[in-house]
């Protein structure tokens, strides 16, 4: 049994790190493999992750981690029974993929404005909470040529768009994703999209 592609891991910087790797041939990951991980820190304990299959030769493991902070470094040992297949380390703060924002809501009852709000995916005591910025993607299924990205670089998870900048009488969709500048993260996955109908009409000119 051999590792073809070594494990690579990303952390949500809250509670879960996801490691993926490929084996040299078809493998029943959960039955044949174990990924052991331990924080390099006093009084830390060794934890075991049971991987799942991810395609024929691929495996994925979801490592549970508490109170993830920048100095954390984990040792990783991939075992097949008594055989050590691979040994490595993982520093979560250097491989962060934020959680996706949630609860994206569109408020169209605000005068002349489409207001989009969403929730920060982290609790206030998490270190990413005050570091997230967002990208909001708005597009129309009725108008395939229309797709815009709005960068939200302030902390408040809201975006206001003048209704007049959107075509009247057609439906739009929006989705949002996040990243954390000071942690040099990748972008999160997109949130589920939400749909609304733009009924705004320009007032008659006098």
């Amino acid at each position: 049994m051999k590792v073809l592609q070594e494990p690579t891991c990303v952390s949500d910087y809250m509670s879960i790190s996801t490691c993926e790797w490929k084996m040299g041939g078809p493998t029943n990951c959960s039955a044949e493999l174990r990924l052991l991980y331990q924080l390099v820190f006093q009084s830390s304990e060794t934890h075991t992750c049971v991987p799942e299959n991810n395609g024929g030769v691929g495996c994925v493991c979801h490592l549970l981690m508490d109170d993830v902070v920048s100095m954390d470094n984990y040792t990783l040992d991939l075992w097949a029974g008594q055989q050590l297949l691979w040994k490595g380390s993982f520093k979560p703060s250097e491989h962060v993929k934020p959680r996706a924002p949630g609860n994206l809501t569109v408020h169209t009852n605000v005068s002349d404005t489409v207001l989009l709000t969403w929730s920060n995916p982290y609790p206030p005591d998490n270190y990413l909470y005050n570091d997230l910025t967002y990208a909001v993607n708005i597009w129309s299924e009725n108008d395939p040529a229309y797709s815009r990205i709005h960068n939200v670089t302030y902390l408040k998870p809201t975006l206001r768009i003048p209704a007049s900048t959107l075509k009247s009488g057609i439906s739009y969709r929006a989705r949002v994703r996040a990243w954390a500048q000071h942690y040099n993260t990748t972008w999160s996955e997109w949130s589920p999209s939400t749909k609304w109908y733009n009924s705004y009409r320009e007032p008659f000119e006098q």
Partner: antibody, heavy 116, light 111 residues
């Protein structure tokens, strides 16, 4: 909100033991390490040791090895620090503090006075 | 015995800027992150800075931290009378199994 509530002040005789408690609330108790530190009157901070509430494993400063014992009770979300063979130099305020590499939440402190 | 050295005291007038240094070595500050704590009279320490230069939520941006080599610095701008306190730096001794160590402490007086 996160709270660490420590037991009240103690007066002990030299040679005795003291057990200080720190009750945690407002968060998942087993998810965060707990440190103990002390501060003698007019002096600086001195680290004593750490306990991992998840499994109960500990690590102590060399100075306190053999004299300090840290335990936890997950049913009450409480950690304990017991210091034995007390001497006058152990008179200090004892703090519990939550965290790993730095400590964002502290108890208010417990004054332990060792006097004959 | 602390191996992180801080000046025993510093002072400045309200509105001024003050810096507090913390000097260590390659087995601690030089190979680790630094945090800073403020201890107001009769109270427990409070985290001001972690990861050398990051502020927890609720800490005003008048407080900033930096690190260079084996030394770290806490800067406080726009001094207020409420800033009068003891300040401690903290880091980790990487020559042991990552045991924390604190600085000797600095008493800040706002004149």
């Amino acid at each position: 909100q996160v709270q660490l509530v420590q037991s009240g002040a103690e007066v002990k005789k030299p040679g005795a033991s003291v057990k200080v408690s720190c009750k945690a609330s407002g968060y998942a108790f087993t998810s965060y390490y707990m440190h103990w530190a002390r501060q003698a009157p007019g002096q600086g901070l001195e680290w004593m040791g750490i306990i991992n509430p998840s499994g109960g494993s500990t690590s102590y400063a060399q100075k306190f090895q053999g004299r300090v014992t840290m335990t936890r009770d997950t049913s009450t979300s409480t950690v304990y620090m017991e210091l034995s063979s007390l001497r006058s130099e152990d008179t200090a305020v004892y703090y519990c503090a939550r965290g790993k590499w730095w400590w964002q939440y502290w108890g208010k402190g417990t004054l332990v006075t060792v006097s004959s | 015995q602390s191996v992180l050295t801080q000046p025993p005291s510093v002072s400045a007038a309200p509105g001024q800027k003050v810096t507090i240094s913390c000097s260590g070595g390659s087995s601690n500050i030089g190979n680790s992150y630094v945090s800073w704590y403020q201890q107001l009279p009769g109270t427990a320490p409070k985290l001001l800075i972690y990861d050398n230069n990051k502020r927890p939520s609720g800490i005003p941006d008048r407080f900033s931290g930096s690190k260079s080599g084996t030394s770290a610095t806490l800067a406080i701008t726009g001094l207020q009378t409420g800033d009068e306190a003891d300040y401690y730096c903290g880091t980790w001794d990487t020559s042991t199994t990552y045991h924390p160590i604190f600085g000797t402490g600095t008493k800040l007086t706002v004149l």
